[in-house]
């Protein structure tokens, strides 16, 4: 008789999830000499231990602590790039500007990027059929709790000037409900972080508005200022040209003042 299985609203665990995590870990540790000491089998065991046999709506940050410990990594605290709703450009940027880091440039972020996973209460099975949706089912699901945990730690590690890339094409350029708005903003440490600098990325070729004046950016400025962190904002009108300037910073069209 087939066992009854909970049907969740979200997509199931990414196929070949264990193999993918293990392969990514091996690849990452080969590329990053400072992480060569990491035992990828132990990393997978700790990752698995965070959600296997647990109810996928009852996951806590504590469940991920063994994984966090194994994935401990030092990134230059003044070279952190946060992002919200504009992951691809943020990643293109750090691929060129190699001394800056998004969360997904760290081991733990790299392992989980674009993946979904969940288990089932009291069985050692991974659920490949469905996983809880953050809105429709529950917020304390394995994926959401993971990103909340690593995002909080990443923000806490930041110092000096922290940059954040925001999507100027969205109706809410700064969204209080995003991971950046709900987790990272509130975990920047005022005693370490001097300035949060927002880069508002324009989508339209002919869009010449100053999106730094957007009401949601003003809201972000207010939140940050209340936390005794300075705020600055820049429009990136042409992201394609911005990336070209990152690649060719010696070009005088990239360095001259407006």
């Amino acid at each position: 008789v087939p066992r009854w299985r909970q049907q969740w609203s979200g997509p199931g665990t990414t196929k070949r999830f264990p193999e993918t995590v293990l392969a990514r870990c091996v690849k990452y540790t080969e590329i990053h000499p400072e992480m060569r000491h990491v035992d990828c089998q132990s990393v997978w065991d700790a990752f698995k231990g965070a959600f296997i046999s647990k109810h996928p709506c009852n996951i806590t940050e504590e469940d991920y602590q063994p994984l966090m410990k194994l994935g401990t990594q030092t990134v230059p605290c003044n070279k952190i790039l946060l992002w919200s709703r504009i992951k691809d450009l943020a990643h293109q940027f750090t691929q060129v500007q190699r001394d800056m880091f998004t969360l997904e440039d760290t081991l733990l972020g790299y392992l989980a990027d674009d993946l979904t996973w969940c288990g089932e209460f009291n069985t050692s099975k991974i659920n490949y059929q469905s996983c809880p949706d953050w809105r429709k089912d529950c917020s304390n699901n394995p994926v959401s709790v993971f990103w909340k945990t690593v995002s909080r730690r990443f923000a806490e590690a930041a110092c000096d000037v922290v940059h954040v890339m925001l999507n100027g094409s969205r109706s809410k350029i700064f969204d209080k409900n995003s991971t950046f708005g709900s987790v990272e903003v509130h975990n920047l440490q005022p005693e370490k972080v001097q300035t949060l600098e927002a880069w508002v990325i324009h989508g339209g070729r002919e869009d010449s508005r100053d999106l730094c004046q957007d009401p949601t950016i003003k809201e972000l400025e207010s939140i940050i200022s209340k936390r005794n962190i300075q705020f600055s904002c820049k429009n990136i009108y042409r992201p394609d040209k911005f990336l070209q300037c990152v690649k060719n910073p010696e070009d005088s069209s990239c360095t001259s003042e407006i």
Epitope: N235, Y237, S256
Partner: nanobody, 123 residues
């Protein structure tokens, strides 16, 4: 006084090529972004291609792979090589430069304009 003078326009058959030149004077050419625009009768002026001071380029989707923008800072001249021309490329072509302070990825407006050169592509 800043002057931009275009040349190289003319009548060409579809599939043919032309090379436009833009000679600049009165400005430190090597420091300026340079752009080529075109305006067909009854249409708005559109940006065709841009080149930064150091040679980074940007193209309108309609000309990508067919047009090539380049510059010779020593000669204070910009170029637009136009290959595989189509009848819809028919327009007056202008070269232009924004103010010195313009940043490649920022908002900037073109301030200096040439008088234009006619390009006609017959089918």
């Amino acid at each position: 006084e800043v002057q931009l003078v275009e040349s190289g326009g003319g009548l060409v058959q579809a599939g043919g090529s032309l090379r436009l030149s833009c000679a600049a004077s009165g400005l430190t050419f090597s420091s300026y972004i340079m752009g080529w625009f075109r305006q067909a009768p009854g249409e708005e002026r559109e940006l065709v291609a841009e080149i930064s001071s150091g040679g980074m380029t940007s193209y309108a989707d309609s000309v990508k792979g067919r047009f090539t923008i380049s510059r010779d800072n020593a000669k204070k001249t910009g170029y637009l090589q136009m290959n595989s021309l189509k009848p819809e490329d028919t327009a007056v072509y202008y070269c232009a430069a924004p103010e010195r302070g313009s940043i490649w990825y920022s908002r900037y407006e073109y301030k200096y304009w040439g008088q234009g050169t006619q390009v006609t592509v017959s089918s």
